[in-house]
């Protein structure tokens, strides 16, 4: 999956948008969609959205989940609709490639 990197000028996908950066919109258009979970003072804050530019999300999507944050990325229209990011459980390893889904 790692080798199948999208090109910078690839097509745009429609993504579900939920979170602080979405304004009044419930969708956005970008080269990748994402679903994230961050822990804010012990409270789970889920967000969904898109990266307009592939390079913008490349590092984020490759970052393994930590105890305080997890991001899952995908490509395809509405591909993040049914993705819920999850924090790592003890004893599990999370290579960055596991968090990237191509549709």
């Amino acid at each position: 999956v790692e080798d199948e990197k999208p090109k910078v000028n690839q097509k745009l996908y429609m993504c579900v948008c939920e979170g602080l950066s979405c304004g009044n919109e419930d969708h956005c258009e970008g080269q990748q969609c994402f679903s994230s979970l961050s822990i804010n003072d012990g409270f789970h804050v889920y967000q969904k959205g898109c990266f307009q530019v592939y390079e913008q999300g490349k590092m984020t999507c490759k970052t393994p989940p930590s105890p305080g944050q997890a991001v899952e990325c995908c490509q395809g229209d509405w591909c993040n609709r049914n993705i819920t990011a999850q924090l790592p459980t003890k004893g599990k390893s999370f290579p960055g490639t596991q968090n990237f889904h191509l549709e």
């Epitope: 939920e18 979170g19 602080l20 979405c22 822990i39 804010n40 003072d41 012990g42 409270f43 789970h44 804050v45 889920y46 105890p67 305080g68 003890k90």
Partner: antibody, heavy 118, light 106 residues
Amino acid sequence: EVQLVETGGGLVQPGRSLKLSCVASGFTFSNYYMYWIRQAPGKGLEWISSINTDGGSTYYPDSVKGRFAISRDNAENTVYLQMNSLRSEDTATYYCAKSTPNIPLAYWGQGTLVTVSS
Amino acid sequence: DIQMTQSPSLLSASVGDRVTLSCKASQNIYKYLNWFQQKLGEAPKLLIYYSNSLQTGIPSRFSGSGSGTDFTLTISSLQPEDVAIYFCFQYSSGPTFGPGTKLELK
């Protein structure tokens, strides 16, 4: 049925310490973040502390940071709040609460009253 | 820190009335907002989570709406058992509660 029972409240002098306990039942305790929230008499609610599932991450507002410490014993299904250097403004009912990942503070205990007075 | 304000602080209404309570955040919190009901001498009880989702077991006369900075809790037909204080709570950043709205019967 989810149950949270707080104990350990009482009258304590300013500057002294007190440790509250919250015993949980009706759910798999070790799978859930836990919280302490307090309410001064006749006043509003204030989030005091959070702890993650294994106790490795704890969170506090500035008002209690450095004085209060949350901990948990998953074997005993219990979360604790160690309160040091107590002040009169810490007088409140202290509630234990739990979340599900999607639903913050979904369940609360009945609370335990802490009175800080000389 | 994000400040939460609620209005009115006291609301008198009659049984059967449609009641609307307001909660405002000092900055964008998207939908990361809950509503709690606290009856006299009891612990708070969760009514609404994520701005508009009804908690299991809560009567359908309660509903929530809003996103960003402005939120509303609506009781479609007030019942005597709804007399309580209602608090909003944001968990977007630095979790904070609103000061509450006391709801009483006229």
